[in-house]
C-alpha cells in the first residue's frame, strides 16, 4: 500500500527530513509549510496549525520559498548613472545596471557603486574586446588591409575593398577608393567577415549586461532551526 500523505504540520520520521517547500520548526518540532515567493511568515506553525503566510508590503520582496518573519527591503532607487532594468515587485528586488555606453567600474557586494563611460576606439583602431557590464573597451590598431574610420565603442576593423583600379589606397583609418564600379571586399588577415554591409557610423549596440542587484539587499534566509537530519529543504 502507498504511504499515507502527511499534511503539514507533521512530525518527521526519526532521521528523516522535511519535504520540498517545507522547513523543520525547532520550537514545534514539526515539518511546516514554507511561504511562497512574494509572501512571508506572518505566524509560525505550532503542533496543530500550519504556517500563516502574508503578502509582502510595498517596496519589500521575497524571491524564494521562505519562512522569514519580514520580507526583504528592495534596494534604493537607481542612481542617476544607472537605469532600472527590473522593477521592485513582491517577488523580486530592483535591478540597476549602468546606462548604455557606461560600465560598472567600481562594484560593491550587490550592484554597482560607480559607473564610468566606456572608452571608444579612434579612427585607425578597432574594438579588440567590447565593453561588458564590468569591463572597459579594449582597442587594437587596424592590421594592414583593414580600417576603421569611426570613434566608436563597438566598431571593429573592417577589410578594405579590393579595387580593379585603385584611385586612393586604403590605410588604417580610411577605406580604399576605387575607380571601377564593382569593388569587392578582401579577407585580410585578422579581418572579421561581415555578411552584410556595415555602416561607417558607429552602431552603438551595447553589450547586454548581466543584471546586478540593487544595493542594500540580500537573498540569504535567516539561519533557522535545523531539521533532525540534513536534507533538501529548498525549492
Amino acid at each position: 500500500l502507498p504511504a499515507q500523505v502527511a499534511f503539514t504540520p507533521y512530525a518527521p520520521e526519526p532521521g528523516g527530513t522535511c519535504r520540498l517547500r517545507e522547513y523543520y520548526d525547532q520550537t514545534a518540532q514539526m515539518c511546516c509549510s514554507k511561504c511562497p515567493p512574494g509572501q512571508h511568515a506572518k505566524v509560525f506553525c505550532t503542533k496543530t496549525s500550519d504556517t500563516v503566510c502574508d503578502s509582502c508590503e510595498d517596496s519589500t520582496y521575497t524571491q524564494l520559498w521562505n519562512w522569514v518573519p519580514e520580507c526583504l527591503s528592495c534596494g534604493s532607487r537607481c542612481s542617476s548613472d544607472q537605469v532600472e532594468t527590473q522593477a521592485c515587485t513582491r517577488e523580486q528586488n530592483r535591478i540597476c545596471t549602468c546606462r548604455p555606453g557606461w560600465y560598472c567600474a567600481l562594484s560593491k557586494q550587490e550592484g554597482c557603486r560607480l559607473c564610468a563611460q566606456l572608452r571608444k576606439c579612434r579612427p585607425g583602431f578597432g574594438v579588440a574586446r567590447p565593453g561588458t557590464e564590468t569591463s572597459d573597451v579594449v582597442c587594437k590598431p587596424c592590421a594592414p588591409g583593414t580600417f576603421s574610420n569611426t570613434t566608436s565603442s563597438t566598431d571593429i576593423c573592417r577589410p578594405h575593398q579590393i579595387c580593379h583600379v585603385v584611385a586612393i589606397p586604403g590605410n588604417a583609418s580610411m577605406d580604399a577608393v576605387c575607380t571601377s564600379t564593382s569593388p569587392t571586399r578582401s579577407m585580410a588577415p585578422g579581418a572579421v567577415h561581415l555578411p552584410q554591409p556595415v555602416s561607417t557610423r558607429s552602431q552603438h549596440t551595447q553589450p547586454t549586461p548581466a543584471p546586478s542587484t540593487a544595493p542594500g539587499t540580500s537573498f540569504l534566509l535567516p539561519v533557522g532551526p535545523s531539521p533532525p537530519a540534513e536534507g533538501s529543504t529548498g525549492d
Epitope: S79, A105, Q117, R119, K120, P141, T150
Partner: antibody, heavy 125, light 109 residues
Amino acid sequence: QEQLVESGGGLVTLGGSLKLSCKASGIDFSSYGISWVRQAPGKGLEWIAYIYPDYGSTDYATWVNGRFTISLDNAQNTVFLQMTSLTAADTATYFCASGYASSSGYYDPKYFGLWGPGTLVTVSS
Amino acid sequence: IKMTQTPASVSAAVGGTVTINCRASEDIESYLAWYQQKPGQPPKLLIYDASDLASGVPSRVKGSGSGTEFTLTISGVRCDDAATYYCQHGFYTSRSDSVFGGGTEVVVK
C-alpha cells in the same frame, strides 16, 4: 586640428540669463562628449554639466539645481550652456572640455584632454 | 566623491622635486587624472588613470597611488613648472558635486 572654442560670455545683470556656445572642429563631434567647467577668479575648477551626443544623455553637478541647461546642435557641431537666475557667485571663466584622445588609439571620456580657451562671464548688480 | 588636495601651495628650487597629494573620500581605484594650469590658460592633462602619462608630457612628471591616496611628483623642477595643479576623479555624473581637487600652487624659486 582638434579644437574647442567658447563664445557668448560677457557682462550680465544679477538674476539675468546668458547662453554660452562651444564650437567643436576637427573632432568626431557626434561621438565625443562635451563638458562645461568653470573657474571663478582666483579659484579652482568646478565641473558643471556634461552631454553625451550619441546617447543624448546629460548630467549636471548636484549644485546646479536646474538653473543651467546643456544642449547641442549636431549639425553645427556646437554645445550650449543656457544659464538662468545668475548670481555674483556665477562670475567665472567658463570652459568647454572633451575627453582624452590617446596616442594608443583610445578616446577616453573620463578625463579632459581637449579644452577651449574659455569665455568670461561677469554678473554685476 | 570629494577630492582633497594638499598642500594648497608649495615652493621648490629649480632642479628639486615637488610632491602633491590628492585624497578621494572613497575608493576610486585608479580613475584619477592630474592637470596643470597656468594663468590665463585652460588646464592641460598631465596624467590619467593615476599613472599614465598623457601625450607630450615629460617623463619627469610621475603619477602614483590607487584607492583613496594619490601623488603627483615632478622631479628636476624647471621654471616652466610654476603653475596650479589639479586632480580629478573620472566619475562625473549627476551624483557629483566635487570632481576636481581644490588645486595646489607650485612656486619655483
